[in-house]
Amino acid sequence: QSGPLPKPSLQAQPSSLVPLGQSVILRCQGPPDVDLYRLEKLKPEKYEDQDFLFIPTMERSNAGRYRCSYQNGSHWSLPSDQLELIATGVYAKPSLSAHPSSAVPQGRDVTLKCQSPYSFDEFVLYKEGDTGSYKRPEKWYRANFPIITVTAAHSGTYRCYSFSSSSPYLWSAPSDPLVLVVTG
């Protein structure tokens, strides 16, 4: 064996955003015929000799960063990419609004404003159906997400979350959905 074994993948099902009280399973997937898996939680570092972790009831203490590796013979794989498991619903939901309006003519600009009842400094915007998210660190109670030159692709349902950078894996409940309609 020359060099480390390829890294496995670590995924959360159904999602890595988990409302408090709900269940989630983390699963480490390596190549076929893996001898043994190790699943680690970081900060503080601890580990289990399993290829999965079932969390029946999401709690604040479950939130954080996870990674996994596997062993074949006496060789270890590279570690998986880290998975950030987020507990949502820890704080009250922010409000999400569109300015000047949630009905926007194509080619115009619109700003989605996420506003929290708390003095949080981090905000995240999700669009339904998209895999990525838009993070914006801001100071105090609000964050603006400008969308320049709107196209039909921007149509859809948006939600935002707020949290404190000092507890980056403990998020608010999601805002009520905002439907952005691109006209013309």
């Epitope: 570092e45 000799d49 270890w76």
Partner: antibody, heavy 123, light 112 residues
Framework: QVQLVESGGGLVKPGGSLRLSCAAS????????MSWIRQAPGKGLEWVSS????????DYAASVKGRFTISRDNAKNSLYLQMNSLRAEDTAVYYC????????????????WGQGTLVTVSS | QSVLTQPPSVSGAPGQRVTISCTGS?????????VHWYQQLPGTAPKLLIY???NRPSGVPDRFSGSKSGTSASLAITGLQAEDEADYYC???????????FGGGTKLTVLG
Amino acid sequence: QVQLVESGGGLVKPGGSLRLSCAASGFSFSDHYMSWIRQAPGKGLEWVSSVGSEGKFIDYAASVKGRFTISRDNAKNSLYLQMNSLRAEDTAVYYCARHYREFRWHYYYFDYWGQGTLVTVSS
Amino acid sequence: QSVLTQPPSVSGAPGQRVTISCTGSSSNIGAGYDVHWYQQLPGTAPKLLIYGNSNRPSGVPDRFSGSKSGTSASLAITGLQAEDEADYYCQSHDLGAHVWVFGGGTKLTVLG
């Protein structure tokens, strides 16, 4: 209270073999990872080998891989280290150490150590 | 050659403050792994002194404290006492081969 007692050390010629034992008491032995750590005379600590709570996960330091074998018998609350093809540089006090565990999780540090057993490899 | 680097010796007078450094790399301390510290009094087995960078097991005086930043860590001892004279070892974990790694040890001498 937690107790770890090593035995089996002694004088052995280069190329010879020795089997160390560690008798554990005062805790649920089968729940914990266990390790052997050694200390050459006047030198620092060197991790030698670890074994998972069920005996499946096994890791060795590069300096002993292929010569030493770690094992455990949870029914007897015992940890073992079979040392073959011994060399002068294996001369050391060998400590048995318990890894901390909390709930389902194992941690990467040693919360209890035995008093050690001396292995001398010399012709 | 130890994976983690510590100064071979430090010294201080009773009542003084001393620090012991422990430097690792991107595959151990820098990979996010915690640093733990052990005290070995002359002729005895090592004893856990600090775990998880800065936590003290019960029975360890608050004169002992630990911290970690980037790829290094340090142990501080304030109000030095004669009974603190011992060898001190840092320990972490290495991600590359999942092995446990130690520093070479630091001999603390309490002067006078």
